[in-house]
Interface confidence: low
């Protein structure tokens, strides 16, 4: 007869690992007992359990409540194990021993691989500002066995780089992704994948980038001047810009304080019926906690009636 | 079977230090977690610390983090609870136990010390 | 943390009289659930692990059920040397927990 086992047996950790251990033998053997055994190089065997045919199993102490036999129906000839709750520790060399009657003892080896699956993190990195050079996004590090594999899933472009971490038993791989910042980036995804032979799919962790930028400030509403003449209605002026974190307008005159009348309404300032007060130079400031900028714009209240005195003027010139 | 003997307890004065000291025999002691548990006078269990087979993994309860450190000399067979910052209410009896498996969170205990009392006052 | 309440925190009985202890988790555990049994200036024994499997050595008259976050410790027929205080503890997450104890007294 011969014993059929496997070489290696791979499990998740926190499995139950099927140690296999069967006999083929010729008809009429029988087989004794089954000794089950740890037997990693540089120590000593330390006893899993004994199969016996008269008095069942026995676990030894250090394995109590984590040896099982599988479930009925089971075969004589069958010296499988279960091994409950796979952990790091129970990694190693196992050796089934085999008493058979009446053709003698035989013995395999096999080695247990426990997979433990990683528990990724990702870290973002410093805040981001339009106009840093190459910066940390984010870093993600995953620690499993073996080691994880960690890449990058993103349409932004940048550069990455990995180092990994040998522990005793398993291995921590942590992988940074650097960009150089740009107000395109924001809301952009940058996904960290993770795979390991001990998750059924991909992990990913997602990080959603936030540049801060402020866009130049430029005011609009002066576009046709002949608009702004006394006794128009509705006239305002509106600051633009854009930016992250959105920015807040204040606005103020160069000349002197805001005349009455005119309302603040964020990054708009209206104004009441134009006369010649409203004239003057108006500066929109725009500022986030990343940067503040200024615009500023002249507005000359035209009077029709000088205007048109003057158009005459020109007539009789003529 | 395995034995485990506690040793190191007595009286201290508050914001004092004790070292506890577990000697196992009679067992393996290398390949299991271990831990300590203890129990104030009149009351119940609380898990206090628990260590790993090779020393790297060691856990604490919140009421202990940076005051007490667990530790192992497997060549000794003997576990050790260096506590420091003494307070009243760490006043128990202190046992020290195998756990079933080698891990330091959790897991049952299989095998326990007498226990060892620590009396913390002035 | 996970919390651990059993019930009832005592009771009294009778030798031969059939003792149920529950306990709760304030969370699922699977079956990462012990019982131990403990007399007065003793340590504690375990009884049962995995929720309901024999410690080796324990009398058969206890058993434990239960999966998830509720468990019972049964003693089927009570003996002299069963009174004493009984708690049980998870170990599905660190720290692990135990319950407040349950004492069992002669009627």
């Known amino acids: 007869g011969e014993l059929e086992t496997s070489d290696v047996v791979t499990v998740v950790l926190g499995q139950d690992a099927k140690l296999p251990c069967f006999y083929r033998g010729d008809s009429g053997e029988q087989v004794g007992q089954v000794a089950w055994a740890r037997v990693d190089a540089g120590e000593g065997a330390q006893e899993l359990a004994l199969l016996h045919s008269k008095y069942g199993l026995h676990v030894s102490p250090a394995y109590e409540g984590r040896v099982e036999q599988p479930p009925p129906p089971r075969n004589p000839l069958d010296g499988s194990v279960l091994l409950r709750n796979a952990v790091q520790a129970d990694e190693g060399e196992y050796e089934c021993r085999v008493s058979t009657f009446p053709a003698g003892s035989f013995q395999a080896r096999l080695r247990l691989r426990v997979l433990v699956p990683p528990l990724p993190s990702l870290n973002p990195g410093p805040a981001l500002e339009e106009g840093q050079g190459l910066t940390l996004a984010a870093s993600c590090t995953a620690e499993g066995s073996p080691a994880p594999s960690v890449t990058w899933d993103t349409e932004v472009k940048g550069t990455t780089s990995s180092r990994s971490f040998k522990h005793s038993r398993s291995a921590a791989v942590t992988s940074e992704f650097h960009l150089v910042p740009s107000r395109s980036m924001n809301g952009q995804p940058l996904t960290c994948v993770v795979s390991h032979p001990g998750l059924l799919q991909d992990q990913r962790i997602t990080h959603i980038l936030h540049v801060s930028f402020l866009a130049e400030a430029s005011v609009r509403g002066l576009e046709d001047q002949n608009l702004w003449h006394i006794g128009r209605e509705g006239a305002m002026l509106k600051c633009l810009s854009e930016g992250q974190p959105p920015p807040s307008y204040n606005w103020t005159r160069l000349d002197g304080p805001l005349p009455s009348g005119v309302r603040v309404d964020g990054d708009t300032l209206g104004f009441p019926p134009l006369t010649t007060e409203h004239s003057g130079i108006y500066v929109c400031h725009v500022s986030n906690e990343f940067s503040s900028r200024d615009s500023q714009v002249t507005v000359d209240v035209l009077d029709p009636q000088e205007d048109s005195g003057k158009q005459v003027d020109l007539v009789s010139a003529s | 079977e395995v034995q485990l003997v506690e040793s190191g307890g007595g009286l201290v004065q508050p914001g004092g230090s004790l070292r506890l000291s577990c000697a196992a025999s009679?067992?393996?002691?290398?390949?299991?977690?271990m831990s300590w548990v203890r129990q104030a006078p009149g009351k119940g269990l609380e898990w206090v610390s628990g260590i790993y087979s090779h020393d790297a993994d060691k856990r604490y309860a919140d009421s202990v983090k940076g005051r007490f450190t667990i530790s192992r000399d497997n060549s000794k067979n003997t576990l050790y609870l260096q506590m420091n910052s003494l307070r009243a209410e760490d006043t128990a009896v202190y046992y020290c136990?195998?756990?079933?498996?080698?891990?330091?969170?959790?897991?049952?205990?299989?095998?326990w010390g007498q226990g060892t009392l620590v009396t913390v006052s002035s | 943390d996970i919390q651990m309440t059993q019930s009832p925190s005592s009771l009294s009985a009778s030798v031969g009289d059939r003792v149920t202890i529950t306990c709760r988790a304030s969370?699922?555990?699977?079956?990462?659930l012990a019982w131990y049994q403990q007399k007065p200036g003793k340590a504690p024994k375990l009884l049962i692990y995995a929720a309901s499997s024999l410690q080796s050595g324990v009398p058969s008259r206890f058993s434990g059920s239960g999966s998830g976050t509720d468990f019972t410790l049964t003693i089927s027929s009570l003996q002299p040397e069963d009174f004493a205080t009984y708690y049980c503890q998870q170990h599905y997450t660190t720290p692990p927990t135990f319950g407040q104890g349950t004492k069992v007294e002669i009627k």
């Open positions: 969370q699922g555990i699977s079956s990462y």
């Open positions: 136990a195998r756990q079933t498996e080698d891990r330091s969170y959790g897991y049952d205990l299989d095998y």
């Open positions: 009679g067992g393996s002691f290398y390949g299991f977690g």
